[in-house]
């Protein structure tokens, strides 16, 4: 299953939208920085596209869930959020099409499950951080920066997979 070229463009648009969502000067938020422990190895160790697609799907689904909460709606510009949802939704559809085609169904399911669980735990840590920080503007900015970084790392993986094949 080859992800369409539009998927790459969508990933870039998603990052652009995340950058545009900024609401406050970030320099005042340095003290709120936090180590969320992005499970980078779960993306780096998947050598076959078949193994990465469910993990990438989980990543985007979790981003969608995180920014779909009422707390998120209160934190960000509604127009930008709507565009952001649309981009994420399209990427989920692209990835689901590959999953439905049965890519990797018989290949190392346990490894995939472990990776998916690691991604879920990562987002649990992010959610807990926001809760502890009472969804402050700075906390949201730290999370936005973290999502930009982790999303960028995961989309770089997609690009390297595409170039390998």
């Amino acid at each position: 299953c080859d992800l369409p070229q539009t998927h790459s463009l969508g990933s870039r648009r998603t990052l652009m939208l995340l950058a545009q969502m900024r609401r406050i000067s970030l320099f005042s938020c340095l003290k709120d920085r936090h180590d969320f422990g992005f499970p980078q190895e779960e993306f780096g160790n998947q050598f076959q596209k078949a193994e990465t697609i469910p993990v990438l799907h989980e990543m985007i689904q979790q981003i969608f869930n995180l920014f779909s909460t009422k707390d998120s709606s209160a934190a960000w510009d509604e127009t930008l959020l709507d565009k952001f949802y649309t981009e994420l939704y399209q990427q989920l559809n692209d990835l689901e099409a590959c999953v439905i085609q049965g890519v990797g169904v018989t290949e190392t399911p346990l490894m995939k499950e472990d990776s998916i669980l690691a991604v879920r735990k990562y987002f649990q840590r992010i959610t807990l951080y926001l809760k502890e920080k009472k969804y402050s503007p700075c906390a949201w900015e730290v999370v936005r920066a973290e999502i930009m970084r982790s999303f960028s790392l995961s989309t770089n993986l997609q690009e390297s997979l595409r170039s390998k094949e």
Partner: antibody, heavy 121, light 107 residues
Framework: EVQLVQSGAEVKKPGESLKISCKGS????????IGWVRQMPGKGLEWMGI????????AYSPSFQGQVTISADKSISTAYLQWSSLKASDTAMYYC??????????????WGQGTLVTVSS | DIQMTQSPSSLSASVGDRVTITCRAS??????LNWYQQKPGKAPKLLIY???SLQSGVPSRFSGSGSGTDFTLTISSLQPEDFATYYC?????????FGQGTKVEIK
């Protein structure tokens, strides 16, 4: 390979203007902030200010606010430090350095080689 | 502004010595403290970030500890290439501030 390359040494007269540069390569320029640090002859490091090249938002040390201007041109991955009217006391080595912003990553992990600015009549 | 105070301002030591430099912040900065090494005519080099994390490529004889207001840089066994000036720097809030430096000289 990550690199920050600064413009060459400058010799200026008091009252003249100056703009020095710091060009980033080997990484996504807009994903990191660029900080500027002054070191006067035989003295320690002084933080001057910082810029987020993604949108040119800046923060200055109160000591340098109004004395210098920090800017960036993301299309050419370059940050700038400028003076509208130099003073003899601006004579120093100026360094740029990369900062990860709000990400949990090493601060000022890469530095430029420095630009020596000499102001003398 | 947060003031950073290093001590001592200079010290003399021999190769193989254990060297300790301290840095005190005027208010709590959690773990947002970095250590840099600078040699004459060169740009500073990051050694330790977030108080105790060793920067990639830095020898393991360098270590950092502390949180809140009191921090320490330790060189477990001083090597000839370690004679330099060391600076602490807080990244808890702007303006970011450096300590005044500690010069490590040969005894």
């Amino acid at each position: 390979e990550v690199q920050l390359v600064q413009s060459g040494a400058e010799v200026k007269k008091p009252g003249e203007s100056l703009k020095i540069s710091c060009k980033g390569s080997g990484y996504s320029f807009t994903s990191y902030w660029i900080g500027w640090v002054r070191q006067m002859p035989g003295k320690g490091l002084e933080w001057m200010g910082i810029i987020d090249p993604s949108d040119s938002d800046t923060a200055y040390s109160p000591s340098f606010q109004g004395q210098v201007t920090i800017s960036a041109d993301k299309s050419i991955s370059t940050a700038y430090l400028q003076w509208s009217s130099l003073k003899a006391s601006d004579t120093a080595m100026y360094y740029c350095a990369r900062h990860p912003g709000l990400n949990w990553a090493p601060d000022f992990d890469y530095w430029g080689q420095g630009t020596l600015v000499t102001v003398s009549s | 502004d947060i003031q950073m105070t290093q001590s001592p301002s200079s010290l003399s030591a021999s190769v193989g010595d254990r060297v300790t430099i301290t840095c005190r912040a005027s208010q709590s900065i959690n773990e947002f403290l970095n250590w840099y090494q600078q040699k004459p005519g060169k740009a500073p080099k990051l050694l330790i970030y977030f108080a105790s994390s060793l920067q990639s490529g830095v020898p393991s004889r360098f270590s950092g500890s502390g949180s809140g207001t009191d921090f320490t840089l330790t060189i477990s066994s001083l090597q000839p290439e370690d004679f330099a000036t060391y600076y602490c720097q807080q990244s808890y809030s702007t303006p970011l501030t450096f300590g005044q430096g500690t010069k490590v000289e040969i005894k």
